[in-house]
């Protein structure tokens, strides 16, 4: 997955820092106090639908394939440009029942973007 | 995630099959000739990104909180209707030295949508 | 500390209105969902509309769709109950509630945090 | 809509009796359920939350137990201050729906 650099307008991983503060997530979240998220942000032309090898990239390849061939519906499906590798990490927080707990928590960074 | 069932168009999940005769990859894949592959489809109003209660649904939230704030560049970052959820598959094929491997190939089946 | 205080409530004539009010403080008010919980004289508890953290989604019971509408003014720390055409029926105890409006592995947040509440009597 | 079925809608019992109180939904919930205690005149107060797990501060007497579409909410050994009303909430599609309650009552 690309990462952006300003200079490409293609589907690209975006560096972003979250703090919990600016979104009121800091009377719930212990620690920590905000964490590089990330995001992905770009075009998604059709010809790099499905070629970010991506964990969706068999499917995407697949679907793309009819897309190439204008087949209904796929023609007007527009291909997205979508967090594809996203990694875990460990929080501290106030659960719904206000018992703190530590724990792994999955999909909360973005590692790597292609296109859908 | 939704089922699609043609009676509203929030991102759900689209029953489609996959002919590998129909994208001309018959002379690779041995078994099977084809596969209830599903896609995605539908809008992603502000409202239901990152509710769908998907993998996705830490950071699109964290995100989403962003985006309702109008906090640049979020405000105008398209929420899509992406596959959350994705399957297996065992698969038999001729690799690239023309052996026969069989194979539990990731990521090949939707199973959930939701938005990113 | 957390707290929600209902006011507005009284009594009133079939078919008038009245408008609810919650104030919150002690918390995020803009990081959570808002809800409306009532109970008649003597009965049960009624879940009646819910409002998200931003006020983009909303949904209310069928008992009462139409005739309600929940609102929440962020910058204000406040929710609102707008109650229209009312009836006999309506009369209850009207609770403000919190909820985080985050899932996690298939699990919604529930309702936490509860207002005193406000009595609403309709009367002629 | 889910209904909840909760039963009995009273009981009678003794300080120190184990007592179950049981939510039954129309369809599968998951975990989402929450089980409240209302005293006369005052606002819900949550002891059970994600079904079978205690509330901060909530005494270690009360556990709930259950998944999809049977709950259960034992209190193990029953004191003065228990003798009042319990419900359950399912909150996993709206509209949330409470049981009917259980009056506890002194025999």
């Known amino acids: 997955g690309l990462e952006c650099d300003g200079k490409v307008n293609i589907c690209c991983k975006k560096q972003f820092f979250v703090s919990f503060k600016d979104i009121g997530w800091n009377d719930w979240i212990i620690a920590p106090s905000g964490y590089h998220a990330n995001y992905c942000e770009g075009e998604c032309p059709s010809h790099i639908a499905g070629t970010s090898g991506s964990s969706l990239s068999f499917h995407s390849t697949v679907i793309n394939h009819y897309r190439m061939r204008g087949h209904s519906p796929f023609a007007n499906l527009k291909s997205c440009c979508v967090p594809t590798k996203l990694r875990p990490m460990s929080m501290l927080y106030y659960d719904d029942g206000q018992n703190i707990i530590k724990k792994d928590i999955q999909n909360m960074i973005v590692e790597e973007c292609g296109c859908s | 995630g939704l089922e699609c069932d043609g009676k509203v168009n929030i991102c759900c999940k689209k029953q489609f099959f996959v002919s590998f005769k129909d994208i001309g990859w018959n002379d690779w894949i041995i078994a099977p000739s084809g596969y209830h592959a599903n896609y995605c489809e539908g809008e992603c109003p502000s409202h239901i990104a990152g509710t769908s209660g998907s993998s996705l649904s830490f950071h699109s939230t964290v995100i989403n909180h962003y985006r309702m704030r109008g906090h640049s560049p979020f405000a105008n970052l398209k929420s899509c209707c992406v596959p959350t959820k994705l399957r297996p598959m065992s698969m038999l094929y001729y690799d690239d030295g023309q052996n026969i491997i069989k194979k539990d190939i990731q990521n090949m089946i939707v199973e959930e949508c939701g938005c990113s | 500390q957390v707290q929600l205080v209902e006011s507005g409530g009284g009594v009133v004539q079939p078919g008038r209105s009245l408008r609810l009010s919650c104030a919150a403080s002690?918390?995020?008010?803009?990081?959570?969902?808002m809800h409306w919980v009532r109970q008649a004289p003597g009965k049960g508890l009624e879940w009646v509309a819910v409002i998200w953290y931003d006020g983009s989604n909303k949904y209310h019971a069928d008992s009462v769709k139409g005739r309600f509408t929940i609102s929440r003014d962020n910058s204000k720390n406040t929710l609102y109950l707008q109650v229209n055409s009312l009836r006999a029926e309506d009369t209850a105890v009207y609770y403000c509630?919190?909820?985080?409006?985050?899932?996690?592995?298939?699990?919604?947040?529930?309702?936490?945090?509860w207002g005193q509440g406000t009595t609403v009597t309709v009367s002629s | 809509d889910i209904q909840m079925t909760q039963s009995p809608s009273s009981l009678s019992a003794s300080v120190g009796d184990r007592v179950t109180i049981t939510c039954r939904a129309s369809?599968?919930?998951?975990?989402?359920l929450g089980w409240y205690q209302q005293k006369p005149g005052k606002a819900p107060k949550r002891l059970i939350y994600a079904a079978s797990s205690l509330q901060s501060g909530v005494p270690s007497r009360f556990s709930g137990s259950g998944s999809g579409t049977e709950f259960t909410l034992t209190i193990s050994s029953l004191q003065p201050e228990d003798f009042t009303t319990y419900y359950c909430l399912q909150h996993n599609s709206y509209p949330w729906t409470f049981g009917q309650g259980t009056k506890v009552e002194i025999k």
């Open positions: 369809q599968g919930i998951r975990n989402n």
């Open positions: 509630v919190r909820s985080r409006n985050w899932n996690y592995d298939n699990y919604y947040y529930g309702l936490d945090v």
């Open positions: 002690g918390f995020t008010f803009s990081s959570y969902g």
